[in-house]
C-alpha cells in the first residue's frame, strides 16, 4: 500500500540554487544554477561544477561523479565506511571495473552497489570484474575494516541497450534544484505518466517542498491524478492527491517522483525545490543488518 502523505504548513524553505527540470530528449535550457540536470542528448551542456564535484578533495568518499569516465580510489580513505555516487544522463548505463582489491571477505569487508534496479553485495572474485548497472546511476559503498584496504575502481558509461525511460522523464543531479512538473505536449507520449529522478551525494538525504495545483478530482482509474514519491533504497512510497503543499524527506540519496497520466491530462502543476539534508543513517546501514523497509 502507499504511505500517508507527509504535509507541512506552507513556509518558504531556504531558497536553493535552481535547476530547471528538462524532459529527456528536449533541448537543454540552463538556468543559473548549482544543481545539474542531464538528459539523454548526446552532449549535454554542463554547468560549472557544484560543491559535490570539486576536483580537489582529500578523500574519494562522499563524492558524486558526473563525468563520462573516471577512476575512483577507495583504498585507505581512513574510514571504514566509504560511499561514492556515479551519475549519467538518462539513457546511459554505468560500467564499473575493479582494478585492485584488498578487501578481506572473511572479515566482513564488502562492496555494495545500488541504484534503481540494483541492490548488490559483493566481495569475492572482484579483481578485473566488470559490473554494468541497469540504469544511469549507481552508488558504490565500501565496507573495509582494515586501514589501507579497499578497492580501486574505473567507471565508464555507455548508451543503454534498451531504454528504461519515457520521453518525458527527467533527471536532476546536485545538492539542490528547482522541481517543475512536466507539461503535456502533443509531440510527447505521456502514456503511463512521467518521472523525475533526483540523485544527490551518497551520504545526503533529499528534502522536497513543493506546491501541487490544478490536480483535478480524479483519484481512481486510468485518469487518476496523483504524484508518487519513492525512496529508491527503502522503497517507501508516498502518494499525494489533490491540491496541496507537500513536504517529503528521503531516507537515502535517491528519489523518484512519478506524475500520473491523469495528472498530466488535468494540466496539473507541481512547483518547488529540493535540497539536501544530512543523513541520519548511512545508506544500507551496517551490512549485518542491511534491511531497509521492506513494505511500500
Amino acid at each position: 500500500g502507499q504511505g500517508t502523505p507527509s504535509l507541512v504548513p506552507h513556509e518558504e524553505a531556504a531558497a536553493p540554487g535552481r535547476t530547471t527540470a528538462t524532459p529527456a530528449g528536449a533541448s537543454l535550457e540552463w538556468s543559473q544554477a548549482r544543481g545539474l540536470l542531464f538528459s539523454p542528448a548526446p552532449q549535454p551542456r554542463r554547468l560549472l561544477p557544484g560543491p559535490q564535484e570539486n576536483s580537489v578533495q582529500s578523500s574519494a568518499c562522499g563524492r558524486q561523479h558526473l563525468e563520462p569516465t573516471g577512476t575512483i580510489d577507495m583504498r585507505g580513505p581512513g574510514q571504514a565506511d566509504c560511499a561514492v555516487a556515479i551519475g549519467r544522463p538518462l539513457g546511459e548505463v554505468v560500467t564499473l571495473r575493479v582494478l585492485e582489491s584488498s578487501l578481506n571477505c572473511s572479515a566482513g569487508d564488502m562492496l555494495l552497489l545500488w541504484g534503481r534496479l540494483t541492490w548488490r553485495k559483493m566481495c569475492r572474485k572482484l579483481l578485473d570484474m566488470t559490473f554494468s548497472s541497469k540504469t544511469n546511476t549507481l552508488v558504490v559503498r565500501q565496507r573495509c575494516g582494515r586501514p589501507g584496504g579497499g578497492v580501486l575502481l574505473r567507471y565508464g558509461s555507455q548508451l543503454a541497450p534498451e531504454t528504461f525511460y519515457r520521453e518525458c522523464d527527467m533527471q536532476l543531479f546536485g545538492p539542490w534544484g528547482e522541481i517543475v512538473s512536466p507539461s503535456l505536449s502533443p509531440a510527447t507520449s505521456n502514456a503511463g505518466g512521467c518521472r523525475l529522478f533526483i540523485n544527490v551525494a551518497p551520504h545526503a538525504r533529499i528534502a522536497i517542498h513543493a506546491l501541487a495545483t490544478n490536480m483535478g478530482a480524479g483519484t481512481e482509474g486510468a485518469n487518476a491524478s496523483y504524484i508518487l514519491i519513492r525512496d529508491t533504497h527503502s522503497l517507501r512510497t508516498t502518494a499525494f492527491h489533490g491540491q496541496q503543499v507537500l513536504y517529503w524527506e528521503s531516507e537515502s540519496s535517491q528519489a523518484e517522483m512519478e506524475f500520473s497520466e491523469g495528472f498530466l491530462k488535468a494540466q496539473a502543476s507541481l512547483r518547488g525545490q529540493y535540497w539536501t539534508l544530512q543523513s541520519w543513517v548511512p545508506e544500507m546501514q551496517d551490512p549485518q543488518s542491511w534491511k531497509g523497509k521492506e513494505g511500500t
Epitope: L112, W119, R120, K125, G193, L228, R230, S260, W290
Partner: antibody, heavy 122, light 107 residues
Amino acid sequence: EVQLLESGGGLVQPGRSLRLSCAASGFIFDDYAMHWVRQAPGKGLEWVSGISWNSGSIGYADSVKGRFTISRDNAKNSLYLQMNSLRAEDTALYYCAKDPNSLYRSGSFDYWGQGTLVTVSS
Amino acid sequence: ELQMTQSPSSLSASVGDRVTITCRASQSISSYLNWYQQKPGKAPKLLIYAASSLESGVPSRFSGSGSGTDFTLTISSLQPEDFASYYCQQSYSTPFTFGPGTKVDIK
C-alpha cells in the same frame, strides 16, 4: 552454470509439516537473495517467500504468513522452506528461484529450479 | 496487494505472426514489471525485466513496453519454440504478484 535443485516434497496430511530444501551451485550464493515460488497443478505462479543475502530481511505472501518460514545457510549454499499447518490449498510445485540482486525486495527471478511437488491430502 | 491481469488468457497463432500480450496492474507500478515464459513441464524463464529490458540470452524478437499500469509483451515473429505460457509479474512492492498467464498455442 547456475543450478538450483529442490528436494523434500511429497504427500503430507493436512495440518502436518514439511521442510523443502534447495541446493544451489554455479554462483556465489551469499551474494544473492533467494525466493520460493509455487504453482498449483494447472494454475498460475504465486510468490511464496523471499530472503535477502544475509537473512537480514524476509518477506512472505499473506496466504503463508505465520505458517511458513524461509531460511538459508550460506555456508552450505542452501535455501529452506519450513512449512507448518499445511492445507489442501498449499498443494503445488514449489520452485526455488534466484534473484539477480542481494535484497529480496528486488523481486525478480532470473534462475529457477525444476521444482518439488508438495501434495497435501488426507 | 497489487492485482495483475492479463489478456488474452489464450491465443492461437502461426509461426511468423506478430503476437502481443497485455498486462495491467491495479495501481501504478512505474516500470517494475517482469515477463516470464513457461513451457509445459518446465520452470519459468525470465524474458524481460523493468518493463522493457531484455534479459541476457533472450532473442531480440521479444520486446516489452509500457509503464504505470499498462504493459505489453510483443513477439515480433513467432517461432516454433515460442509456443508456451507467458506471465507478467510486478516487482514494485511486496507481496510480489503474477498475472494469471497467457497461453500461446499453434493455430
